[in-house]
Amino acid sequence: AGVFELQIHSFGPGPGPGAPRSPCSARLPCRLFFRVCLKPGLSEEAAESPCALGAALSARGPVYTEQPGAPAPDLPLPDGLLQVPFRDAWPGTFSFIIETWREELGDQIGGPAWSLLARVAGRRRLAAGGPWARDIQRAGAWELRFSYRARCEPPAVGTACTRLCRPRSAPSRCGPGLRPCAPLEDECEAPLVCRAGCSPEHGFCEQPGECRCLEGWTGPLCTVPVSTSSCLSPRGPSSATTGCLVPGPGPCDGNPCANGGSCSETPRSFECTCPRGFYGLRCEVSGVTCADGPCFNGGLCVGGADPDSAYICHCPPGFQGSNCEKRVDRCSLQPCRNGGLCLDLGHALRCRCRAGFAGPRCEHDLDDCAGRACANGGTCVEGGGAHRCSCALGFGGRDCRERADPCAARPCAHGGRCYAHFSGLVCACAPGYMGARCEFPVHPDGASALPAAPPGLRPGDPQRYL
């Protein structure tokens, strides 16, 4: 656990021509505030994607009124650091977005109005515990100068805040298998994460997942006493009074307090001291109210009905998020079918279709039967994103436009002769056979295998296949 800290040094016009107009005027006084959003890794994420490492909002800066005729100077800044607490390891590489917001203080109906003045973003490598890093970023005609660092919250140390340190329990040396905690030489590195259930008082580990017992204790979790020897040496059994060993994992390990809360151990458990704006057992509940102006982009703040939501931001069209901080990307609705590329143009959604597809949502397969005519009485059959024509007798080809020789497939059985006919084919059957394809033998008694010949046809007559 630790805290990312951001110090804004200046925000004003960048060098070069085209200095920006002051964002404030005598008629519209305003003040600035900043928002920082952190994401792990070096991913080039969209500004609206979640701030997985955390986010923070500065206080409002002093009210500023432009002096008529004067160029925009560096604008007055809010006091203090922006702090983004992180609960887990510091990732070492991170992406940041820093937004400069203007709060207009004129006679706004319904309270002040907010607008985004500038947004800068970058990707950096940073070890926790290192010195302040300085940076300059430009956004259009504006320039932002700032410093940042990541620091671990005790008892965590190291470049990723993953090692834990404890004050020494013995004046001369650290406990078994534990090194001094550079740069805090008067502290000792805390035990590794031992096997689950390993006694924090009587066990320790030099490798993660093991449980090695101090003298006088035994068992897989070092919970079984061997003798009642008192704490005569640094390797003796630990007790609350003698304090011979670096204590094992305590209730505050890993800092269970969210949102920058500090943890203190109590006889039974732990207690979180929460920063302003948060409360709850683990500082997990935001105490921000509408008076703090938490809704961006003209969102309307309404007091929440319960502690879970001390306020709710009703966002104007085009914005979403608990603070209306995210521009709605309606493409996240996944409206385009068949691999179409979505474009949110603000006033409308557009789908750019892949070849072979069309329609506002790329839902039409251009190879399908929609609008496809099969000639000469053929019928269209869809399948597998393609289409084919099932042609009427006498026709073939992709669209049934080609005349087919219906006799080419030798359809007449038992030596019957095939004749092409305008409506299909006719089989003239050999003696002893009948049927449309001469498929039925005529029985010697004159009866056929069929229940009866169709009226008007004698067995052996040529049959037209319709």
């Epitope: 994607s49 979640p50 069209p317 979403q320 709605v328 309606r330 996240s332 609705l333 996944q334 409206p335 385009c336 079918r337 409308a348 789908c351 506002p360 949502r361 790329c362 839902e363």
Partner: antibody
């Protein structure tokens, strides 16, 4: 064929948490966003929001910010709706529905949640 | 938010009748108007999307029309299985909104 199958009815006490599942089959789960709709007893349909099944990013209607959370288990083609700190007014039937670019074209059968002390 | 109003909350008709259910939007929304059917057992089905397109598997006696702010669903030849509540929904502007529903009963 396309199907959305939701988990069974739930009876909860105020202050508790409920998690409803919606298992999709018959299509590629990550091609379509999943939406959630609430219907209080004897009332109409109310759209709660959606979750992008490719990125996992949710979007909530104003009345469903705070205690409501949409999530996914993509490997199981399943979407979830979790409601924390349940209140009596959360008593309703909740539907999941697939979006096809124009409309919610396939719906789950609904999950009834009753909150009562 | 766009408000969707179905002025008729319930409607009685005889089998074989031609039935029209109307829906009005508080502002124009580019034809992204859908109609859903909710059966007495609670199941919900899409009938018509994008104002007038028939969803697959829906009988052709259902049709939709309209533009701007006024839309309607028509059942040309009422059948017993059409007894249900019908909802309109706009899918153009977030948040999506539904009409209050029109319950269709047999005389």
């Amino acid at each position: 064929q396309i199907q959305l199958v939701q988990s069974g009815p739930e009876l909860k006490k105020p202050g508790e948490t409920v998690k409803i599942s919606c298992k999709a089959s018959g299509y590629t789960f990550t091609d379509h966003s999943m939406h959630w709709v609430k219907q209080a007893p004897g009332k109409g349909l109310k759209w709660m929001g959606w979750i992008n099944t490719e990125t996992g990013e949710p979007g909530y209607a104003d009345d469903f910010k705070g205690r409501f959370a949409f999530s996914l288990e993509t490997s199981a083609s399943t979407a979830y709706l979790q409601i924390n700190n349940l209140k009596n007014e959360d008593t309703a039937t909740y539907f999941c529905a697939r979006y096809d670019g124009y409309a919610m074209d396939y719906w789950g059968q609904g999950t009834s949640v009753t909150v009562s002390s | 938010d766009i408000q969707m109003t179905q002025t008729t909350s319930s409607l009685s008709a005889s089998l074989g009748d031609r039935v029209t259910i109307s829906c009005r939007a508080s502002q124009d929304h580019s034809n992204y108007l859908n109609w859903y059917q909710q059966k007495p057992d609670g199941t919900v089905k899409l009938l018509i999307y994008y104002t007038s397109r028939l969803h697959s598997g829906v009988p052709s006696r259902f049709s939709g029309s309209g533009s701007g702010t006024d839309y309607s669903l028509t059942i040309s030849n009422l059948e017993l299985e059409d007894i249900a509540t019908y909802f309109c929904q706009q899918g153009d502007m977030l948040p999506w909104t539904f009409g209050g529903g029109t319950k269709l009963e047999i005389k």
